[in-house]
Interface confidence: medium
């Protein structure tokens, strides 16, 4: 008998090279094989459970950056007046959540912020839990 | 043929709002659906393997905090003279281990330490390994 | 019907007690049960996907340490002029990658660097993806 295969784990890596002041970051998924989707610069959560979250980037100017998942809830990450980020965390997310950025710069110029090495990874840690598509 | 489902992954999120000097932190599991159990302010390990461990909290006063898993072994985390923690780590735990806090304050007052946003998450990383219940 | 068992997750914990200047660290796997292999002081990657990577150690002298996975690619970790490391990260690795250290010391003496508590853990996060052995 063939041993059972794992169904694909919900995971995604998105890249961002540009953020807009008082808005968010323009995220793109470099691979078509991702098991999670991007919509309106947000990562769509279909499965309940813990997620491993990795966030990296170097910014062209000082900014404050938050990563949100649900209106009215605190951010997953919140960094104040930084020029780079290299953080890892764990959070419980659920069906219908959307993971998105909010960015504020402190310069008088309201230009885009360039990002080098900008990467956000989400990996579901509870396969077998509730999912809805 | 229906593809196999994942059996539930061993994981738990516990909260703590109070720690006792020279003792530990009072931990509670907010969800009844957790796949791991709390007993005597310890998280019980049933399955051998690597665990992803996330620890967060803001303390009402400066303290030294350690997270242990086995008598006679070094701590999983050890923080000296801090008022907050936001750490993530990986450790190999085994059946019969118990994850628990030890706390020491540096004040002469032996009051309980209040904790804001106190959260400890454990997620098993090696499903398919040995478990005993 | 018996619920399906998980095939073993690709994971490994290696230890290192010694690093050689302008070379790497001598890594050994303390367990024979690891699902990943060490070859020529490198950890061999057989499965595509995200990996959780934990790196710890205390060094006998100041050094610069990088953890590589593929020629011509940037490092997974890069630490400059440190005497200890306690880092965690996530990276996408693929079949044929090899995870290995590069170390440089700043002393005129070309002695080996001793390492206390040197530990590198890799845990595959995408079971069900492509593997080749």
């Amino acid at each position: 008998q063939v041993p059972p295969q794992y169904p694909p784990i919900q995971s995604i890596r998105v890249q961002f090279t540009r953020c807009e002041n008082e808005k968010g970051c323009i995220i793109t998924s470099p691979s078509k094989d991702e098991t999670m989707k991007v919509q309106d610069n947000s990562i769509i959560i279909n499965c309940d459970g813990f997620y491993l979250i990795s966030l990296k980037g170097y910014f062209s100017e000082e900014l404050s950056l938050s990563l949100y998942y649900r209106k009215g809830r605190g951010p997953l990450f919140s960094l104040s007046k930084v020029t780079s980020v290299d953080s890892i965390g764990v959070a419980y997310l659920a069906f219908k959540d959307k993971v998105y950025f909010n960015v504020t710069t402190h310069s008088t110029s309201y230009k885009d912020i360039q990002v080098n090495g900008g990467e956000l990874i989400l990996i579901h840690q509870n396969p077998g839990g509730f999912c809805a598509y | 043929q229906v593809p196999p489902q994942y059996p539930p992954i061993q994981s738990i999120r516990v909260q703590f709002t109070r720690c006792e000097n020279e003792k530990g932190c009072i931990i509670t599991s907010p969800s009844k659906d957790e796949t791991m159990k709390v007993q005597d302010n310890s998280i019980i390990i049933n399955c051998d393997g690597f665990y992803l461990i996330s620890l967060k909290g803001y303390f009402s006063e400066e303290l030294s905090l350690s997270l242990y898993y086995r008598k006679g072994r070094g701590p999983l985390f050890s923080l000296s003279k801090v008022t907050s923690v936001d750490s993530i780590g990986v450790a190999y735990l085994a059946f019969k281990d118990k994850v628990y806090f030890n706390v020491t304050t540096h004040s002469t007052s032996y009051k309980d330490i209040q904790v804001n946003g106190g959260e400890l998450i454990l997620i098993h990383q090696n499903p398919g390994g040995f478990c005993a219940y | 019907q018996v619920p399906p068992q998980y095939p073993p997750i690709q994971s490994i914990r290696v230890q290192f007690t010694r690093c050689e200047n302008e070379k790497g660290c001598i890594i050994t796997s303390p367990s024979k049960d690891e699902t990943m292999k060490v070859q020529d002081n490198s950890i061999i990657i057989n499965c595509d996907g995200f990996y959780l990577i934990s790196l710890k150690g205390y060094f006998s002298e100041e050094l610069s340490l990088s953890l590589y996975y593929r020629k011509g690619r940037g490092p997974l970790f890069s630490l400059s002029k440190v005497t200890s490391v306690d880092s965690i990260g996530v990276a996408y690795l693929a079949f044929k990658d090899k995870v290995y250290f590069n170390v440089t010391t700043h002393s005129t003496s070309y002695k080996d660097i001793q390492v206390n508590g040197g530990e590198l853990i890799l845990i595959h996060q995408n079971p069900g993806g492509f593997c080749a052995y």
Partner: antibody, heavy 118, light 107 residues
Framework: EVQLVESGGDLVRPGGSLRLSCVAS????????MSWVRQAPGKGLQWVAF????????TFADVVRGRFTISRDYAKNALYLQMNSLRAEDTAVYYC???????????WGQGTLVTVSS | SFVLTQLPSVSVTLRQTARITCGGD??????VYWYQQRLGQAPVLIIY???NRPTGIPERFSGASSGNTATLTISGALAEDEADYYC??????????FGGGTHLTVL
């Protein structure tokens, strides 16, 4: 005093390889993003490659992508440009430049000349 | 990719105002940087993020940017200002783009 000193420039045949080095002093190398910028004889500046302070992010001009790699050695305070499959049009003075905010090239070296000719 | 257009040369009478322009599609939405390169020397950053001067750069140098044009202004040009001037931006793919350069002659 901040100093960037390039070396490794030489005469090389088309299709050949060369490795340029840039040694930094007078500032905290770890905190600075680094670039290579070139200038063909009698021509303007052309950016070539960038590596961020942590070494994890690199970008390249389209004309050198796949042929050139950029790397850094924190122990030696050194930046490198490995140039393969060289062409006549790669002939230029190559400058290394650094910036604490990576959009500025705050400091520049004096350059090293690379000549690609048969 | 993003193209920056500069006039090859500009002349100015000693102690008069020189203006060097840099054209590019909606360049006003990007941060613009200016470099001075004297003959036989390495470039020097003189303006960053449109209109900011690094420490040590004289006040006579200023910058502005809007629409499709960025401008470097030298108020009261001196003989030592004779040099090549390059504008630079980063495009949305994080590639640095330089203009072709403008040679300033001080008469």
């Amino acid at each position: 005093e901040v100093q960037l000193v390039e070396s490794g420039g030489d005469l090389v045949r088309p299709g050949g390889s060369l490795r340029l080095s840039c040694v930094a002093s007078g500032f905290t190398f770890n905190n600075y993003h680094m670039s290579w910028v070139r200038q063909a004889p009698g021509k303007g500046l052309q950016w070539v490659a960038f590596i961020n302070s942590g070494g994890s992010g690199t970008t390249f001009a389209d004309v050198v992508r796949g042929r050139f790699t950029i790397s850094r050695d924190y122990a030696k305070n050194a930046l490198y440009l490995q140039m393969n499959s060289l062409r006549a049009e790669d002939t230029a003075v190559y400058y290394c430049a650094s910036g604490s905010i990576w959009t500025h090239f705050d400091y520049w070296g004096q350059g090293t000349l690379v000549t690609v000719s048969s | 990719s993003f193209v920056l257009t500069q006039l090859p040369s500009v002349s100015v009478t000693l102690r008069q105002t020189a203006r060097i322009t840099c054209g590019g599609d909606i360049i006003g939405s990007k941060n613009v940087y200016w470099y001075q390169q004297r003959l036989g020397q390495a470039p020097v950053l003189i303006i960053y993020r449109d209109n900011n001067r690094p420490t040590g750069i004289p006040e006579r140098f200023s910058g502005a940017s809007s629409g499709n044009t960025a401008t470097l202004t030298i108020s009261g040009a001196l003989a030592e200002d004779e040099a090549d001037y390059y504008c630079q931006v980063w495009d949305n793919s994080n590639k640095a783009m330089f203009g072709g350069g403008t040679h300033l002659t001080v008469l």
